[in-house]
């Protein structure tokens, strides 16, 4: 299927001009390659009429141009002084030959309709109303006024001043006069349909002295607006129907042969195919509303219509707006998993794509809610604090410049299952939908923190350990302190070279975090997680409460009250064949003030975990295992 898109049918009248826009995929090659407009002959040959290389055929000389708009990925063909000879089949396309990528366009040029010389032409859109002005001479002021519609043989009454109304115009036609002006009457017809188009005659009086006026009413279907969108991207249908329908229910439907199937309306109807990826914005006082659809699929391509009616369904004679949506399969939006699976108590890390050209845009994550017109309240964002009910378990990690940001949600429950949107305040095409499925956990989590009920004592040393399985051995481990502005990764200090491990003991892989000395600001949520480069993996969370020292408890008395242990990542995996008696010592980390310590230790973790890490008088914290960690202040 060609990725070039344009209007399928273009119609005009002799002497007028047309402007034809063709869309092409957003690539550097496409922006610079030759654009052409050619006419298809009976033999299947397509004869170039105009191209972006400067070629202009004789028959287009002085009346056509082709303009490329690389910033929009479109080119436009303008043709003036149309004649009926211009009716035919054309192609707009890209490439060095006319056999390149193209789109078929049918152009129809009609004759100017012949109308009586004094005819007044009114051109209105379907669903709108028209007010026809009917002048008359003063002597006909007392006479009957009427409007009739010409049929083949006669003129069928629409309405007259004796309050006679044609049944098909009841409730739609009104005859009236304004103020004291006795030389003109008006007929207003509302909710116009195609059937209302035609020739009308206004009349005041009877016989030869009657005043008559010819009126031509043209009722037009709105020209569909072309929308060219990438697969997996997002589209917004901006619908502006006018104040007169501001209080009516609104809908968006998709044409299906003769009918238009409602996709969504403001009365709560929604097509299941669009579950989790559609929203209708609140209506405003001017009758404007918009429908947002994310995660575009091939099958979403088609002809869409928005409208307003109390039923929330398409109704003849009500205003509409139309679009032709093309879904380009050569998408710039990366193909990511649209379903992410998690388990209760576990976590998910969701990679959200954004337009790499907009790395400074603000990133957001919202949860789609289908009730009413649908909502997507933002749960977290670059500058948007985490919503209160997600405290301690949700964070957004922006990785500037690489076209991806990550949202991590942990402590999952089945309530978290649903649809979520990734979006920015920039290019709205890059909105994507993720479905989160949460199953009941059937085994222990991969990451486990001990102690689980964490209460640290002010001024003392406190260590928490995060146990991870061997499969995470090669991944980077981290601790971060959560706040409603994000999860700040605690700096780690790699202690010495890693040793190769003969085997990996499932029970002994851990990364520890030590708070030394504990302060009131240390209270809060901490996450232990794994990542590989910029790709985040699993996390687990723990809340550390800080309480005052109770009388009689031991305490650390550092020489410098402000001194705090640095986060040190001591990664030592011990060969399981080495006996505990060998006491492999970890190098002294040295004095680091006001910081945190992370330790990542090997197979004597059990003993480290069991130890109380009581502080000695000089402020050193020691583990009671055969490994000694000296933290000098």
């Amino acid at each position: 299927k060609s990725p070039i898109f344009g209007p399928q049918e273009v119609s005009s009248i002799e002497g007028d001009s047309v402007s034809i826009t063709c869309y092409y995929p957003d690539t550097s090659v496409n922006r610079h390659t030759r654009k052409y407009w050619c006419r298809q002959g009976a033999s299947g040959m397509c004869t170039t009429l105009i191209s972006s290389n400067g070629y202009l055929s004789k028959e287009y000389s002085g009346r056509a141009n082709l303009i490329n708009f690389p910033e929009n990925n479109t080119f436009v063909i303008n043709i003036e002084q149309l004649t009926q000879d211009d009716t035919g089949s054309y192609k707009c396309g890209l490439g060095t030959s006319n056999r390149g990528l193209s789109f078929d366009v049918s152009l129809e040029v009609s004759q100017v309709p012949e109308l009586p010389s004094d005819t007044h032409v009114y051109t209105k859109d379907i669903g709108r109303n028209v007010t026809i002005e009917c002048p008359f001479k003063r002597e006909n002021a007392p006479s009957k006024k009427s409007l009739c519609k010409k049929t083949n043989q006669s003129c069928e009454l629409v309405i007259d001043s004796t309050e006679k109304v044609n049944p098909s115009y009841i409730g739609r036609a009104k005859l009236f006069m304004k103020g004291t002006d006795l030389t003109v009457f008006y007929v207003n017809i509302s909710h116009l349909t195609h059937n209302d188009a035609g020739l009308y005659i206004c009349q005041a009086g009877e016989g030869p002295s009657a005043d008559k006026k010819n009126v031509d009413l043209q009722v037009l279907a709105p020209e569909p607006e072309l929308l060219y969108k990438d697969l997996r991207s997002s589209v917004t249908f901006e619908c502006d129907l006018g104040r007169e329908v501001a209080n009516e229910a609104k809908y968006l439907c998709r044409m299906n042969k003769e009918t238009c199937d409602v996709i969504i309306n403001t009365l709560g109807k929604r097509d299941p195919d669009f579950e989790g990826r559609i929203l209708i914005t609140p209506k405003d006082d001017n009758g404007r509303f918009s429908v947002l659809i994310t995660g575009l699929r091939k099958e979403d391509a088609g002809h869409y219509q928005c409208g307003a009616h109390s039923s929330g369904l398409p109704q003849e004679g009500w205003p509409i707006q139309t679009w032709q949506l093309f879904v380009n399969e050569e998408s710039t939006i990366p193909n990511r998993r649209s379903v992410v699976k998690g388990v209760t108590g576990g976590s998910v890390a969701i990679a959200c794509p954004y337009n790499p050209k907009e790395s400074s845009s603000l990133k957001y994550w919202c949860r789609w809610e289908g009730d009413g017109n649908g909502h997507c309240p933002v749960l977290v964002g670059t500058q948007a604090q985490v919503q209160e009910e997600y405290e301690g378990r949700l964070a957004l990690f922006d990785q500037p410049g690489n076209g991806t940001y990550t949202v991590i949600l942990n402590q999952l429950t089945t309530e978290d299952a649903g649809f979520y949107w990734c979006l920015t305040n920039g290019d709205s095409r890059w909105r994507t939908t993720i479905e989160l499925q949460v199953a009941e956990a059937t085994r222990e989590p991969n990451l486990e923190v001990t102690p689980q009920n964490a209460t640290a004592v002010l001024g003392e040393t406190f260590t928490v350990s995060c146990h991870y399985p061997c499969k995470f051995y090669s991944q980077e481990k981290y601790w971060c302190k959560w706040s409603n502005k994000g999860c700040h990764i605690l700096p780690s200090h790699d202690e010495g070279a890693r040793q190769s491990s003969v085997s990996c003991d499932q029970s002994s892989q851990l990364v520890s975090m030590t708070l030394n000395p504990v302060s009131k600001e240390d209270e809060g949520w901490y996450w232990c997680g794994v990542k590989q480069g910029q790709t985040y993996g699993e996390t687990t969370a723990i809340y550390i409460a800080v309480e005052e020292r109770t009388r009689g408890s031991s305490h650390v008395n550092p020489t410098d009250a402000n001194a705090r242990a640095k986060v040190a990542l001591e990664e030592e995996v011990v060969d399981s064949s080495i006996s505990e008696k060998e006491n492999k010592a970890i190098p002294n980390p040295g004095p680091f003030a006001n910081e945190r310590e992370i330790q990542n230790v090997g197979d004597q973790a059990q003993e480290n975990r069991a130890s109380g890490d009581a502080g000695s008088a000089d402020g050193q914290s020691r583990s009671s295992s055969s490994k000694h960690h000296h933290h000098h202040h």
Partner: nanobody, 131 residues
Framework: EVQLVESGGGLVQAGGSLRLSCAAS????????MGWFRQAPGKEREFVAA????????DYADSVKGRFTISRDNAKNTVYLQMDSLKPEDTAVYYC????????????????????????WGQGTQVTVSS
Amino acid sequence: EVQLVESGGGLVQAGGSLRLSCAASGRTFDSYAMGWFRQAPGKEREFVAAISWTGGSTDYADSVKGRFTISRDNAKNTVYLQMDSLKPEDTAVYYCAAEVVGRDVTTMYRVSGLEYEYDYWGQGTQVTVSS
């Protein structure tokens, strides 16, 4: 409830520039669409500029288009109005206003130039442009 405090007003010569700031109190600044209005002596209060809660959408009165720029910093709970090429007719008290829209995708681009749609107002800051 949000409190709005404008600052940055003052006396400036025609052709000069000023930058107004509006600091908002409260945790939920990013659930408000913000606007600037002004009132010249003896005249009605009129719309100047508005910005959506994300900052992704802005709107301006015709009289200031191309000269004034509205922006916001949600991390600092502040909205700004950069006023360049000032004219004597820009002299007025400038008010900052907040409309509760909620942090929702459906309101991401919502901006309003209608006074009655705003829920909170600042006290105003005087801007005087001399010729």
